[in-house]
Amino acid sequence: DGCKDIFMKNEILSASQPFAFNCTFPPITSGEVSVTWYKNSSKIPVSKIIQSRIHQDETWILFLPMEWGDSGVYQCVIKGRDSCHRIHVNLTVFEKHWCDTSIGGLPNLSDEYKQILHLGKDDSLTCHLHFPKSCVLGPIKWYKDCNEIKGERFTVLETRLLVSNVSAEDRGNYACQAILTHSGKQYEVLNGITVSITERAGYGGSVPKIIYPKNHSIEVQLGTTLIVDCNVTDTKDNTNLRCWRVNNTLVDDYYDESKRIREGVETHVSFREHNLYTVNITFLEVKMEDYGLPFMCHAGVSTAYIILQLPAPDFRAY
């Protein structure tokens, strides 16, 4: 069929709750492309009717909610004028009752479901909620061993649970819950998180290291396309998030209307005790307003920026 397979993504999901996956792969999806979702090599695309339980919402596939029989491989086909790429997503649905005494027995949970707090430090857990704009998420509630978390040491801040002065008793099974509203209907999202405690930060600790960029400027012509990688080294037990910001706002939010500047999909390479992360920023078309503005790569407490500047005029041309 002439489509190039990009990669296979595995997702392990809980039945009876919403799930969404965004088909995005900059720079491919940054240009003029059409995105179509299919299930299990079917020739019939996933429905785009918003009343359907499973439907395509822009570049997303949305399950409202996920059901046992939805397990399988889904394909997202990205067609450009002269190109065709395909991403495979292998979804495994399991029945999980989060108030069981153990989260054990789940195959290869992703890092989103396994998080680490550092003993004696102020730390945080993150509730990973990835949904299209058509889904409105209510405030997040946090639970530990099925009891809602309360107390001075715990603060809910957007999608994070801040935990001050982490103690050994903070290990265990957590869940974050939010109400998702879509087309007037409400659904409960409940993510279980297995939390372990480490003393490692009490040794040398580890702050994410941004290898590139290095707080420098990049000469770039007006109107061109530019992709800049942010390369970060971090220990595997850290739960830092990496992102690009401008004017202290996520670039995807700041350029939400035009989508002219977008953050790419993060990739990582495993190296012994560390992960090497790459997340890029794509300027589809550099505009005058981009020059002189610091575009910041954030990784936990670490930051580094690039500043775009116009190339020096070449007087030899005159």
Epitope: Y203, G204, S206, S270, E273, H274
Partner: antibody, heavy 121, light 108 residues
Amino acid sequence: QVQLQESGPGLVKPSQTLSLTCTVSGGSISSADYYWSWIRQHPGKGLEWIGSIYYTGSTYYNPSLKSRLTISIDTSENQFSLKLTSLTAADTAVYYCASEEANWGSHFDSWGQGTLVTVSS
Amino acid sequence: DIQMTQSPSSLSASVGDRVTITCRASQSIDNFLNWYQQKPGKAPKLLIYAASSLQSGVPSRFSGSGSGTDFTLTISSLQPEDFASYYCQHSHSAHPITFGQGTRLEIK
């Protein structure tokens, strides 16, 4: 950058065990940003990575030496050590300890001055 | 294991010359490659890491390039103190670390 100093015998008999220690100064061996490594260089030859240890005790060994090799770490003394058993003349080399910074992959950014170990009866 | 092959194994050059040493990996190592300089009786010294990043304190006449399997160390204008042996080394994820066999740079 940290300073490293190897110590141990210069002459070892065949079939015996080589024990070397590397003392780290000017920085903590418990840094999460570093692995601590041993590298050797046979006379007139190139460099051979022996193995590395992380402050948690996780070890990474050259497969060709793994069966004879133990690397350990003592964070209280800011030292790490190498034990290589069943020595032969082919183990005669200058042995270096080095700090291996976890950066983009890793690289050896500080080295000891090296200690010549001769395996001979 | 990943084999690292350097060429040439030795070369003669004069002060002021531009010198290029190449290193080839037996499989792709992205940009996980470092370069070292070693003088007789001394420990190696890191020059370049991540294929092209200059280590702090290393003169800017040293530069590195390449990605995948083919890499280059360039000395733009040889100085008397640059006559030494040079080694490449990979640090790619799950593979044991290996060095190239070395390149000996001599005065012509």
